[in-house]
């Protein structure tokens, strides 16, 4: 697994460097997670042809993965910093159950999957410090998450591979949108 942000040898070798600002730390954290997702997607796509044929192989996708919409205020048109930050944090909290599902779904990238999960927890903490309106953030219900996890794990192997692919793709898109939005804040 790659070294988490702030722990690479360059950082150790340059103690005179200015400490990262909160925004820089968040930016770096997201890019680190995106690198991890790329590695996981590589294993998933190499293992099956899910990455090319996912659209035509499905009639319905009821995964309900978090997605950015116009009303969330994260796009350039209608940008709203507070609304967007709430959406990013809420979305990441919703993704956590899916990241839990990804554990044990990888053979050669097991550590990488764990790193993505743990780094996302850290990212949520960074973002919560930045948010003024924490009351607007809804935390997913643990009971609902537990039954969702059971449902996902009860799927057959092919559906689980497809689920893994869709989670990684959606999480990547969500993080990329978040990164663009946070750079405007």
């Amino acid at each position: 697994a790659p070294v988490p942000p702030g722990e690479d040898s360059k950082d150790v070798a340059a103690p005179h460097r200015q400490p990262l600002t909160s925004s820089e730390r968040i930016d770096k954290q997201i890019r680190y997670i995106l690198d991890g997702i790329s590695a996981l997607r590589k294993e998933t796509c190499n293992k099956s042809n899910m990455c090319e044929s996912s659209k035509e192989a499905l009639a319905e996708n009821n995964l309900n993965l978090p997605k950015m919409a116009e009303k969330d205020g994260c796009f350039q048109s209608g940008f709203n910093e507070e609304t967007c930050l709430v959406k990013i944090i809420t979305g990441l909290l919703e993704f956590e159950v899916y990241l839990e599902y990804l554990q044990n779904r990888f053979e050669s990238s097991e550590e990488q999957a764990r790193a993505v999960q743990m780094s996302t927890k850290v990212l949520i903490q960074f973002l919560q410090k930045k948010a003024k309106n924490l009351d607007a953030i809804t935390t997913p219900d643990p009971t609902t998450n537990a039954s969702l996890l059971t449902k996902l794990q009860a799927q057959n192997q092919w559906l689980q591979d497809m689920t893994t692919h869709l989670i990684l793709r959606s999480f990547k898109e969500f993080l990329q949108s978040s990164l663009r939005a946070l750079r405007q804040m």
Epitope: L58, E60, N61, L63, N64, K151, A154, Q155, N156, L159
Partner: nanobody
Framework: QVQLVESGGGLVQAGDSLRVACAAS????????MAWFRQAPGKEREFVST????????YYADSVKGRFTSSRDNAKSTSYLQMNSLKPEDTAVYYC?????????????????WGQGTQVTVSS
Amino acid sequence: QVQLVESGGGLVQAGDSLRVACAASGRTFSIDAMAWFRQAPGKEREFVSTMNWSTGATYYADSVKGRFTSSRDNAKSTSYLQMNSLKPEDTAVYYCAAARGLLIATDARGYDYWGQGTQVTVSS
């Protein structure tokens, strides 16, 4: 486990109608999707139709759209495929399949449980 048994196949003339049924038994409460596939001699198994078992939403292959209709009877845990305007190319063994999960597939690999199939022959 879920057991599936198809019935209602037979020999019909082109242009006729036929309704095949699929009765599910066992752990039917775990079913999220019920589908129909078919396999003609020497050909690969082909998707015909699938249904979200809880909402009743249906999806069809382009080749049967407008001619075939899928329906269900929840109380009897039975799925039906009404086939109208049948063509000789509809001749195949029709299989019923069921799956658990949040994704509803048009790919046979997305289904856990299968019936033994019922033969439908359409003569010209």
